[in-house]
Interface confidence: low
């Protein structure tokens, strides 16, 4: 039977005044030698020789200083041999613990933590979570770790608080604004011992990044803008609105959107948003008609890319800025409206016989000019001719077989109108529908049913049918179209500048 | 006036690693990202990644994933591209380019030739 | 990874003509949210980096002749160069910046007939 005893020793510190640090006895002894042997770490295994036994009394002293980080306790395996190095016992497994003392201090995981949290959080949010760790015994006061911050910049008020336990660090309150601070530092000791004044400390920064949200209201520059305008003019730099809003530059938070609450009601406007710069360019996409509207009053307002963050959603209330526009006439001189007609020449019309009139309107007046002359342009088959002061087109000659094989029974010519003071040309479109001769030796063709117009853009076939009664001084018919878009399109009047 | 400035030509063997530099002028250095963009010789463009030099943040192509690091030295305006374990198809002039986020680069280096090779 | 596919490869057109260049995407690169088209066209010159000259798909970059037009939303983009300059010889990319990895179209070469 083993009869043990053994103490425990304590790191860092000299053992010797405590040896022998155990001892061991077999009961054997009493009527025999017995040797007694040890073995394990600390023993015949690194780190060697710390215990050493008395072979003859069984006791085990310790020679040498350990450290309970490295060993936190060590397995004496024991043996009682007889003269024949017989086991008189079962091998003893004797536990010799190490006592910790706080040789150990804290450890961060980081020497600087990276956090962010929104501006305007609420109180108590978490923004991030220390790590530390203390080498020392766990569960032991020497590797209890409290936080506390020492440091915050900038120092104006504090603004975070940490769980000394967890090492939570929290918003104070919910006053942070990043249009503030950006940023902030803080540095936070961990101490162990609980933050005994015994204890070992070390320290860590935190760089808490302060996160924009959309808790201002952008605003215009100016509260109202007056601009002049051409009609008839696209301009693609009217004006600049400048936006100012303090949020994160270049963030969805801090560009704006503005737009029309009014007034643009014909969409002749657009604000073309310039993101680098949160400029707005006010744009003429749609030409202004100064006849139709001398001046008009634009209402803007301006938001953001980005919702509004839910802390300032009261406070918004739409600003409108005013942009009076007042429209400047151009003088624009006659053009064809509508810029294509067709006409229709029946059989039995003869030299000098009206076709129709083709007159040029006076834009400024909306009347027919009365400063130009006409002439015809392209004129194939050489088959009209017009009245250079009226616009009155009439037959040249009767149209023969030639003519109308060669046309096809459909003519398309050009008439110009010339304003020699303004030096502007401006072309309208001749369509002729040459009806059939009937049993007339002079056609061969069938009755033709279709028009042709031309706005000056396209072509379109319309099929019509036709009244072929006529009468001796204007026996033709009249059918004109509207160019598309209605509005005053200077490509679909087919205007000229120059001689 | 806004200007990139890449290092020089290097020639580099297998295995080894460069690192390009890209030295901006003329604009607020923080306000912008600047891309890498290579091109390989006689062919197209290939993106390889984007630092902002706001915040640090950055985006790598996925094939170049693990090799390359982008870096910005705000005192010196300075963005560093490394790449390391070079093969020889990594032979290609470099690029860099400025922009806010990931398109729309409106100002470019003269570019740097890496040569790969044995 | 979003694919672009230009077409033609190599274009050949007298001074004075247009040219057309097509840039289709495997997949869209508008974005719902801005309604915009992530997708730029650059020029390249021999020995020169690559020159941004529209933006947006149709957004001239500054300084950048009105001569190039870009047209085009969601998968099928044109540049087109009216009356084509000697100086606009060089190879025409397309590169889109909707998703990651970003992507450049293989480019067209424009050169005078």
């Known amino acids: 039977e083993w009869i043990k005893f053994a103490a425990a020793c304590r790191e860092g510190e000299d053992n010797s005044k405590r040896n022998p640090i155990a001892k061991i006895h077999s009961d054997c002894a009493a009527n025999q030698q017995v040797t007694y042997r040890i073995s394990g770490v600390g023993i015949d295994q690194p780190p060697y020789g710390i215990f050493v036994i008395n072979q003859k009394t069984g006791e085990i002293n310790i020679t040498s200083i350990v450290d309970r980080e490295v060993t936190p306790f060590f397995i004496i395996y024991c043996r009682a041999l007889n003269s024949m190095g017989q086991d008189l016992e079962r091998p003893l497994e004797l536990r010799v613990r190490v006592l910790d003392i706080n040789d150990n201090p804290p450890v961060f995981s980081m020497a600087t933590f990276a956090g962010q949290i929104e501006e305007n959080s609420n109180a108590n949010t978490l923004v991030m979570i220390l790590n530390a760790t203390d080498a020392d015994e766990p569960n032991n006061l020497n590797s209890k770790i409290a936080f506390k911050i020492i440091r915050q910049e900038p120092s104006d008020s504090p603004m975070f608080i940490i769980n000394r336990n967890t090492g939570e660090i929290r918003t104070m309150n919910n006053f942070l604004d990043r249009e503030q601070y950006g940023q902030y530092a803080l540095a936070v000791r961990g101490s162990d011992r609980d933050g005994g004044a015994d204890g070992m400390s070390a320290e860590c920064e935190c760089n808490i990044k302060i996160l924009d949200v959309n808790d201002n209201i952008p605003y215009m520059e100016q509260s109202s803008y007056t601009i002049e305008i051409q009609e008839n003019t696209l301009n693609s730099n009217l004006l600049e609105i400048r936006v100012i809003d303090l949020d994160e530059e270049f963030s969805a938070n801090w560009m704006a959107v503005i737009f029309f609450i009014s007034g643009n009601e014909g969409n002749w406007f657009e604000i073309e948003m310039n993101e680098r710069t949160n400029v707005g360019i006010l744009k003429v996409v749609k030409p202004l008609d100064y006849e139709a509207m001398q001046s008009l009053q634009l209402s803007i307002g301006v938001r953001n890319k980005a919702e509004f963050h839910h802390s300032i959603m009261s406070q918004y209330k739409l600003k409108a800025s005013a942009i009076s526009v007042t429209v400047l006439n151009v003088i624009e001189g006659p053009v064809f409206r509508p810029g294509s007609k067709t006409y229709v020449v029946t059989g039995n019309m003869g030299s000098n016989d009206k076709v129709g009139d083709f007159v040029a309107t006076d834009l400024d007046t909306g009347r027919p000019s009365t400063t130009v002359r006409y002439v015809m342009g392209n004129n194939p088959a050489d088959l009209l001719a017009v009245d250079s002061r009226t616009g009155k087109l009439t037959l040249k000659n009767k149209v023969t077989k030639e003519q109308y094989n060669m046309l096809g029974g459909k003519y398309q010519g050009t008439i110009l109108s010339i304003d020699d003071n303004l030096q502007r040309t401006c072309t309208g479109t001749i369509n002729i529908n040459i009806q059939s001769f009937g049993n007339d030796d002079r056609t061969n063709t069938e009755p033709n049913t279709k028009i042709t117009t031309n706005t000056g853009r396209q072509e379109s076939t319309s099929s019509t049918n036709y009244d072929t009664s006529t009468t001796s001084t204007d026996s033709s018919q009249v059918y004109s179209s509207e160019p598309g878009n209605g509005a005053k399109d200077l490509l679909s009047d087919n205007v000229h500048f120059g001689p | 006036q806004v200007q990139l400035v890449q290092s020089g030509a290097e020639v580099k063997k297998p295995g080894a690693l460069v690192k390009v530099s890209c030295k901006a002028s003329?604009?607020?250095?923080?306000?912008?990202?600047i891309t890498w963009v290579r091109q390989a010789p006689g062919q197209g463009l290939e993106w390889m990644g984007w630092?902002?030099?706001?915040?640090?943040?950055?985006k790598y192509a996925q094939k170049l994933q693990g090799r390359v690091t982008m870096t910005t030295d705000t005192p010196t305006n300075t963005v560093y591209m490394e790449l390391r374990s070079l093969r020889s198809d990594d032979t290609a002039v470099y690029y860099c380019?400025?922009?806010?986020?990931?398109?729309?680069?409106?100002?470019w280096g003269q570019g740097t030739l890496v040569t790969v090779s044995s | 990874e979003l694919v672009l596919t230009q077409s033609p490869d190599s274009l050949s057109v007298s001074l004075g003509e247009r040219a057309t260049i097509n840039c289709k995407s495997s997949q869209t690169v508008l974005y719902n949210s801005d309604n915009k088209n992530y997708l730029s066209w650059y020029q390249q010159k021999p020995g020169q980096p690559p020159k941004l000259i529209m933006n947006w798909a149709s957004i001239r970059a500054s300084g950048v002749p009105d001569r190039f037009s870009g047209s085009g939303s969601g998968t099928d983009f044109t540049l087109t160069i009216n009356s084509l300059q000697a100086e606009d010889v060089a190879i025409y990319y397309c590169q889109q910046y909707y998703s990651t990895p970003l992507t450049f179209g293989g480019g067209t070469k424009v050169e005078i007939k």
């Open positions: 630092i902002s030099v706001y915040n640090g943040d950055t």
């Open positions: 380019a400025r922009g806010y986020g990931s398109g729309n680069w409106d100002y």
């Open positions: 003329g604009y607020t250095f923080t306000n912008y990202g």
